[in-house]
């Protein structure tokens, strides 16, 4: 492999924790217009496994607002609007990266963290366990 | 928002772009009890709007591999296994943060980027447009 020369154009880091503590530019690329998932689609209402979106706010985290899906029913909604309990509404989860202020309240010091969020719900056939 | 007091124990930043460039501890903290709980469900197969997972790979990004859900059908799967085209399988999308080296090959400088990924699929009632 190529030995990468220390580039004079790179930010310098003499931090004793290097390489674990680095500079991160938060001037985000691909900043989308909407951050509220309700604005981007109404699937949460039209799904056979509808969900509500709950605002999870934490000023010590970036992004400070994350929307968490909670399935409205245990079962799935049929064409007639009734709930079919032979099927299950389940949350689809995704692991995401966030930044958490560390130490707390320090405006420019963060730690990378992985958290699990529920993005929406889907309707699944239940697993039936047969008792011998 | 709250005015965060300048804590004397915080790393100092006189960067003119502050708070766009921050110090981040990259020793990733996983808030979940198991290594990766999202990996253990088979909803993608059991859903009435099943999906396949496609690999999106980029060696210059962390995480290097992201899985993209692609709905298997236009319609939704009925109890008898046939597809009902009066309903629609649609992808549920989520905006996630990834890290990219910037400038490239600088060991201690990163940029945060937002990307939109499809996490799974859900079954929705179609929007019917009536022609006057």
């Amino acid at each position: 492999g190529i030995a990468i020369p220390r580039n004079s154009g790179c930010p310098n880091s003499e931090d004793k924790n290097f390489p674990r503590t680095v500079m991160v530019n938060l001037n985000i690329h691909n900043r989308n217009t909407s951050t509220n998932p309700k604005r981007s689609s109404d699937y949460y209402n039209r799904s056979t496994s509808p969900w509500n979106l709950h605002r999870n706010e934490d000023p010590e985290r970036y992004p400070s607002v994350i929307w968490e899906a909670k399935c409205r029913h245990l079962g799935c909604v049929k064409a007639d609007g009734n709930v079919d309990y032979h099927m299950n509404s389940v949350p689809i989860q995704q692991e995401i990266l966030v930044l958490r202020r560390e130490p707390r309240h320090c405006p420019n010091s963060f730690r990378l963290e992985k958290i699990l969020v529920s993005v929406g719900c889907t309707c699944v056939t239940p697993i039936v366990h047969h008792v011998a | 928002g709250i005015a965060i007091p300048r804590n004397s124990g915080c790393p100092n930043s006189e960067d003119k772009n502050f708070p766009r460039t921050v110090m981040v501890n990259l020793n990733i903290h996983n808030r979940n009890t198991s290594t990766n709980p999202k990996r253990s469900s088979d909803y993608y197969n059991r859903s009435t709007s099943p999906w396949n997972l496609h690999r999106n790979e980029d060696p210059e990004r962390y995480p290097s591999v992201i899985w993209e859900a692609k709905c298997r059908h236009l319609g939704c799967v009925k109890a008898d296994g046939n597809v009902d085209y009066h309903m629609n399988s649609v992808p549920i999308q989520q905006e996630i943060l990834v890290l990219r080296r910037e400038p490239r090959h600088c060991p201690n400088s990163f940029r945060l980027e937002k990307i939109l990924v499809s996490v799974g699929c859900t079954c929705v009632t179609p929007i019917v447009h009536h022609v006057a």
Partner: antibody
Framework: QVQLVQSGAEVKKPGSSVKVSCKAS????????ISWVRQAPGQGLEWMGS????????NYAQKFQGRVTITADESTSTAYMELSSLRSEDTAVYYC??????????WGQGTLVTVSS | DIQMTQSPSSLSASVGDRVTITCRAS??????LNWYQQKPGKAPKLLIY???SLQSGVPSRFSGSGSGTDFTLTISSLQPEDFAVYYC????????FGQGTKVEIK
């Protein structure tokens, strides 16, 4: 094309340590993890731990916790695995592998470590 | 740890045969299962990732299926170069491998 080239075979005494290197040629480490997997003679594969060289973050298998140290030097695109307090059961071929955190898609050629008095 | 159990531990087959190897996980792992081929004195080689996706450069006679706890690797028409040991591996949690299946010439 990524190639992982490992250091040569080692013979060690019980109680000593061994440090095996793994150099990525044909590119940098990129954002992948590097995992270490060992295989005792005639046996199966056993994951020992991993490092994300970009971050220096390590993750070790419970069995090797406290005895294994994985490090990486990005300037030379080299990862290292050091195993201490060696015993005869540690005689094995040690492999490094590029790890996407979902699968191991590129492997080193392996380094035979023999522990014998 | 998640235990992976392969069967059979060895099998004898002829060139042209259809070969099936199974792998069972001690708990549900969704589709986070990979298959590797290892020849004597060589490093393992990734064949199938995420239960059913063929790694680039791997012949299409190899295929994988399954989800949850039960998985299968199939070689549709065994070729001389396919005689080797095959391992399954889960990555739902810290990685663990099956004990291996040796495919020998009949």
């Amino acid at each position: 094309q990524v190639q992982l080239v490992q250091s040569g075979a080692e013979v060690k005494k019980p109680g000593s340590s061994v440090k095996v290197s793994c150099k990525a040629s044909g590119g940098t480490f990129s954002s992948y993890a590097i995992s270490w997997v060992r295989q005792a003679p005639g046996q199966g594969l056993e994951w020992m731990g991993s490092i994300i060289p970009w971050f220096g973050t390590t993750n070790y298998a419970q069995k090797f916790q406290g005895r294994v140290t994985i490090t990486a030097d990005e300037s030379t695109s080299t990862a290292y695995m050091e195993l201490s307090s060696l015993r005869s059961e540690d005689t094995a071929v040690y492999y490094c592998a590029r790890d996407s955190e979902y699968y191991f898609d590129h492997w080193g050629q392996g380094t035979l470590v023999t522990v014998s008095s | 740890d998640i235990q992976m159990t392969q069967s059979p531990s060895s099998l004898s087959a002829s060139v042209g045969d259809r070969v099936t190897i199974t792998c069972r996980a001690s708990q549900g792992i969704s589709n986070w299962l990979n298959w590797y081929q290892q020849k004597p004195g060589k490093a393992p080689k990734l064949l199938i990732y995420a239960a059913s996706s063929l790694q680039s450069g791997v012949p299409s006679r190899f295929s994988g299926s399954g989800s949850g706890t039960d998985f299968t690797l199939t070689i549709s028409s065994l070729q001389p170069e396919d005689f080797a040991v095959y391992y399954c591996q889960q990555y739902s949690d810290d990685p663990t491998f099956g004990q291996g299946t040796k495919v020998e010439i009949k």
